[in-house]
């Protein structure tokens, strides 16, 4: 039997996943967005500024189980999912409301993972098999990068990461956090 699906903090149901999930469905369908964060309102202002420092991107908290063959993590892990296009920071809270999204006419701006952290997970296996320990790579922050028409994705231009950093005061080396800090983060996610 498969593992039960579960709810994450963005209200959607997430089935079991491998170590790295596919981008979850809420990235393309705003119906499952965290309503408290989204508000469901369209952007109030058209995009005008060209100031790079105002570019930012959405960081969605995503909770999932780690699986390895028939084994599944004892507890879910929480990481960020970097959402779609980038827009001016001042519009971000409402930027995806009602399916609307700012899109540049020239270069493509993408929100991609910036920093990662490592977290050890305990995998429980069926049939009395001994638990396994695994260290997984989790997205810790996102950033905007610019992709021009003349470049492929390997040549994304860094837009400066400060505007896209999580607002929770993450340290420069987010993976060097204690197990207690990671546990607290998980517990606070529910």
């Amino acid at each position: 039997q498969g593992w039960q699906a579960f709810k994450n903090d963005a209200t959607e149901i997430i089935p079991e996943l491998g170590e790295y999930p596919e981008p979850p469905p809420e990235l393309e369908n705003n119906k499952t967005m965290n309503r408290a964060e989204n508000g469901g309102r369209p952007p109030h202002h058209p995009f005008e500024t060209k100031d790079v420092s105002e570019y930012s991107c959405r960081e969605l908290h995503f909770t999932r189980y780690v699986t390895d063959g028939p084994c599944r993590s004892a507890k879910p892990v929480t990481e960020l999912v970097c959402s779609g296009q980038c827009g001016p920071a001042r519009l971000l809270p409402n930027a995806i409301g009602r399916g609307k999204w700012w899109r540049p006419s020239g270069p493509d701006f993408r929100c991609i993972p910036d920093r990662y952290r490592a977290q050890r997970v305990q995998l429980l296996c069926p049939g009395g098999e001994a638990p396994r320990a695994r260290k997984v790579r989790l997205v810790a922050s996102c950033k905007c990068k610019r992709l021009t028409r003349f470049h492929n994705q390997s040549e994304l231009k860094d837009f400066g990461t400060e505007a896209a950093r999580p607002q929770k005061g993450r340290k420069p080396r987010p993976r060097a956090r204690s197990a207690k800090a990671n546990q607290a983060e998980l517990e606070n996610a529910y």
Epitope: L17, G18, E19, Y20, P21, E22, P23, D68, C82, R110, I112, P113, R115, Y116, R117, A118, R120, A133, R134, K135, V136, R137, Q153, S154, R173, R175, A176
Partner: antibody
Framework: QVQLVESGGGLVQPGGSLRLSCAAS????????LSWVRQAPGKGLEWVSN????????YYADSVKGRFTISRDNSKNTLYLQMNSLRAEDTAVYYC??????????WGQGTLVTVSS | DIALTQPASVSGSPGQSITISCTGT?????????VSWYQQHPGKAPKLMIY???NRPSGVSNRFSGSKSGNTASLTISGLQAEDEADYYC???????????FGGGTKLTVL
């Protein structure tokens, strides 16, 4: 079972280009990071590049940055390495490896790239 | 990333135990980063033998074990067998968790 099969290697002149492919099977391709690792004749292993599960983030060793491009097609379960401006020092066996849990748990058999005039 | 340091060669007789060291810096091996070990027979692809310092993948003999002290990780092979003769590489990941560094490799000869 997990299988990774590289192809596309061969003899190329300095300054030339080559595209390597790695066909994967036996696992959920889109759920894993993947890497290219190379080994020059008689030398050790050198990590070249990796790519995250959906291809949105790519990373390179300094020695290949700006010349090599890693990409993936999740619909075809295939990993690629586009190698441009090749140099003699790029001569090596190139392995694709599944980059899972911060180590390489499965490797392909490798494909030889020879850069020579 | 600077390569990890391994001895070029080690040797031992069948039935003996040998240890291969892998020395890094505080930002790779010595940090919370974990070390993995790979075995490579001539003309073959590398095979994962140890991950996360001291964990064995299923199918790997329990004669192989790993440990770490400070900036040095070690691979110990007990009860040496002829088929253990191969090159062994240690590896760790960089600070960003997106790059990797390998040791120069150690040739194990079973006398």
């Amino acid at each position: 079972q997990v299988q990774l099969v590289e192809s596309g290697g061969g003899l190329v002149q300095p300054g030339g280009s080559l595209r390597l492919s790695c066909a994967a099977s036996g696992f959920t391709f889109r759920s894993h990071w993947l890497s290219w690792v190379r080994q020059a004749p008689g030398k050790g292993l050198e990590w070249v590049s990796n790519i995250n599960y959906d291809g949105s983030s790519t990373y390179y060793a300094d020695s290949v940055k700006g010349r090599f491009t890693i990409s993936r097609d999740n619909s075809k379960n295939t990993l690629y390495l586009q190698m441009n401006s090749l140099r003699a020092e790029d001569t090596a066996v190139y392995y694709c490896a599944r980059d899972t849990y911060l180590h390489f748990d499965y490797w392909g058999q490798g494909t030889l790239v020879t850069v020579s005039s | 990333d600077i390569a990890l340091t391994q001895p070029a060669s080690v040797s031992g007789s069948p039935g003996q135990s040998i240890t291969i060291s892998c020395t890094g810096t505080s930002s790779d091996v010595g940090d919370i980063n974990d070390v993995s070990w790979y075995q490579q027979h001539p003309g073959k692809a590398p095979k994962l033998m140890i991950y996360d310092v001291n964990n064995r993948p299923s199918g790997v003999s329990n004669r192989f074990s790993g440990s770490k002290s400070g900036n040095t990780a070690s691979l110990t092979i007990s009860g040496l067998q002829a088929e253990d003769e191969a090159d062994y590489y240690c590896s760790s990941y960089g600070e960003s968790l997106t790059s990797y560094v390998f040791g120069g490799g150690t040739k194990l000869t079973v006398l």
